[in-house]
């Protein structure tokens, strides 16, 4: 698995470099996760034909993956820093159960899947420090998450492959939209 941001050899070799600001750290963290997702997508697409499948809609109906919409305040029209930040954190917390599902779904990229999961937890902590209105952030119910995880794991092989593909694609899109908005803050 790749080394987490701030721990690569370049950082060690340059001790006099300015420490990263909180925004730079978040930016770097998201790009690190996006790199991890790319690696996982590569394995998924090589292993099955899910990436070209037109049957995505069938599986997508069973998943309630977080999505960015205009009302969330993260787009330029109606941009609202606090509303958007709450949406990003809430969305990431909702993705955690799906990232847990991904854990055992990869053969050659098992470490990478773990790195994406752990890096997302760190990202949530970074963002929570940035948010002023933590009360507005709703944490998913653990019991609901547990039964969702059981349901996802009980699917047939084709649906499990499709679910993996959809989770990775949706998580990537969510992170891209999140970082677009964060770069305006």
């Amino acid at each position: 698995a790749p080394v987490p941001p701030g721990e690569d050899s370049k950082d060690v070799a340059a001790p006099h470099r300015q420490p990263l600001t909180s925004s730079e750290r978040i930016d770097k963290q998201i790009r690190y996760i996006l790199d991890g997702i790319s690696a996982l997508r590569k394995e998924t697409c090589n292993k099955s034909n899910m990436c070209e499948s037109s049957k995505e809609a069938l599986a997508e109906n069973n998943l309630n993956l977080p999505k960015m919409a205009e009302k969330d305040g993260c787009f330029q029209s109606g941009f609202n820093e606090e509303t958007c930040l709450v949406k990003i954190i809430t969305g990431l917390l909702e993705f955690e159960v799906y990232l847990e599902y991904l854990q055992n779904r990869f053969e050659s990229s098992e470490e990478q899947a773990r790195a994406v999961q752990m890096s997302t937890k760190v990202l949530i902590q970074f963002l929570q420090k940035k948010a002023k209105n933590l009360d507005a952030i709703t944490t998913p119910d653990p019991t609901t998450n547990a039964s969702l995880l059981t349901k996802l794991q009980a699917q047939n092989q084709w649906l499990q492959d499709m679910t993996t593909h959809l989770i990775l694609r949706s998580f990537k899109e969510f992170l891209q939209s999140s970082l677009r908005a964060l770069r305006q803050m």
Partner: nanobody, 124 residues
Framework: EVQLVESGGGLVQAGGSLRLSCTAS????????MGWFRQAPGKEREFVAD????????WYADSAKGRFTISRDNAKNTMYLQMNSLKPEDTAVYYC?????????????????WGQGTQVTVSS
């Protein structure tokens, strides 16, 4: 890395319109966030507009809001900038840029591929 070529620049009178195109060669154009920047003589390059992987997610500089429209056609590997109500102060070389992370943003450092630019001159 993607190769970018701009076209559509030219000389136009104030109040007129132009449509710039940026065509990308290379695979997976749809996974790139794309942006337009411009550089007027003697000035620094500045952000104009950008469009995310989700084509509804666009951002504009204040100077471009209401007059310029950014769009993309993934089937044609092309991004556009429709510029209306042009002013002499819009005179600049317009550059198109791509971000392989699919994020984009209002700063040059967010982009890893750049075109050579196309000249836009607005006469009064």
């Amino acid at each position: 890395e993607v190769q970018l070529v701009e076209s559509g620049g030219g000389l136009v009178q104030a109040g007129g319109s132009l449509r710039l195109s940026c065509t990308a060669s290379g695979r997976s154009f749809s996974s790139y966030a794309m942006g337009w920047f411009r550089q007027a003589p003697g000035k620094e390059r500045e952000f104009v507009a950008d469009i995310g992987v989700n084509p509804d997610n666009t951002w504009y500089a204040d100077s471009a809001k209401g007059r310029f429209t950014i769009s993309r056609d993934n089937a044609k590997n092309t991004m556009y900038l429709q510029m209306n109500s042009l002013k002499p102060e819009d005179t600049a070389v317009y550059y198109c840029a791509a971000d392989s992370y699919g994020v984009g943003g209002g700063a040059e450092r967010y982009y890893d591929s750049w075109g050579q630019g196309t000249q836009v001159t607005v006469s009064s």
